[in-house]
């Protein structure tokens, strides 16, 4: 994920509960990572800014039938206003740079929990 | 189903340690936080803070710092909660819960039955 | 810390009418992403355990008789009880999960005359 222009709020932001679980959730799936996350396959990046809870689901929809991730999808399912279909792009995605899943949920929880650090959740 | 079974009454000196357990059986202990709540003497319920079994990750309750540490075993799925430097205030009964707020499609919250601590000289 | 302040702390009533207990947030636990509030109510019934009757401020928890109702949005929320049978005797509370450190109201108990 590549952050353009500095950082932004990302409002409106979880819960930090909420917020809290998912972190969990993406530690879980590095940590327990033996194969290749969902065979190697290839998403989008994007920009943690303003509406990266929406521009995440989006790129992760993307994928399908990797069981791993969909605990993940539900979450940023509850954290995106709109209904989320595969084959949707937001202006977040750097639409010229597509990285692995697993450097993508890396990325996504260094800045999850950067934000968890900072309070920026309510 | 869903079980949370909790140690059993302790009486315990000012000044003293005390490890609470609380066992968990029916689910994946690792897929869901485990919370404890204090409650004295028939008061409010008081969130002390809780605890991630998987990473062993906490979030505590700024109240109970330094009073309160808690800790998870994976292998037999118990959850724990240590509580020192003991005095009079300590004593109540503790619950341990498990629980998620992940959203939209769950939400969960299953208590023990709760442990009596006694703190008296 | 977000206080949850509860009313009336007890209440007395008869079996078979309407009883409504309210709780206040000090602040919104409404999440406009998913329009869910982060507000659970709990039943105490003397000598046990706090028992889950609703979450996210509205949705019954599977086995809660349908006599109980939450409603309420932000920082204003209400549990109904439709018409109270002698076994709802107990202490309601309720209790945020929007942020930490996790609160819960003072309680609210009821009697059944």
């Known amino acids: 994920l590549t952050c353009l222009g500095g950082f932004a709020s990302p409002g409106p932001v979880p819960p930090s509960t909420a917020l809290r679980e998912l972190i969990e959730e993406l530690v879980n799936i590095t940590q327990n990572q033996k194969a290749p996350l969902c065979n190697g396959s290839m998403v989008w990046s994007i920009n943690l800014t303003a509406g990266m809870y929406c521009a995440a689901l989006e790129s992760l929809i993307n994928v399908s039938g990797c069981s791993a991730i969909e605990k993940t999808q539900r979450m940023l399912s509850g954290f995106c206003p709109h209904k989320v279909s595969a084959g949707q792009f937001s202006s977040l995605h750097v639409r010229d740079t597509k990285i692995e899943v697993a450097q993508f949920v890396k990325d996504l929880l260094l800045h999850l929990k950067k934000l968890f650090r900072e309070g920026q959740f309510n | 189903q869903i079980q949370l079974q909790q140690s059993g009454a302790e009486l315990a000196r000012p000044g003293a340690s005390v490890k609470l357990s609380c066992k968990a059986s029916g689910y994946t202990f690792t897929s869901y936080g485990i919370s404890w709540v204090k409650q004295r003497d028939g008061q409010g319920l008081e969130w002390i803070g809780e605890i991630y079994p998987r990473s062993g990750n906490t979030d505590y309750n700024e109240k109970f710092k330094g009073k309160a540490t808690l800790t998870a075993d994976k292998s037999s799925s118990t959850a724990y909660m240590e509580l020192r430097s003991l005095t009079s205030e300590d004593s109540a009964v503790y619950f341990c819960s498990s629980f998620t707020t992940l959203v939209p499609t769950d939400y969960f919250d299953y208590w023990g039955q709760g442990t009596t601590l006694t703190v008296s000289s | 810390d977000i206080m949850m302040s509860q009313s009336p702390s007890s209440l007395a009533v008869s079996v078979g009418e309407k009883v409504s207990m309210t709780c206040k947030s000090s602040q919104s636990l409404l999440y406009s992403s998913n329009q869910k509030n982060y507000l659970a109510w709990y039943q105490q019934k003397p000598g046990q355990s706090p028992k889950m009757l609703i979450y996210?401020?509205?949705t019954r928890e599977t086995g809660v008789p349908d006599r109980f109702t939450g409603s309420g949005s932000g920082t204003d929320f209400t549990l109904t009880i439709s018409s109270v049978m002698a076994e709802d005797l107990a202490v309601y509370y309720c209790?945020?999960?929007?942020?930490?450190?996790?609160?819960f109201g003072d309680g609210t108990k009821l009697e059944v005359k």
């Open positions: 209790h945020q999960y929007f942020t930490y450190p996790r609160t």
């Open positions: 996210w401020a509205s």
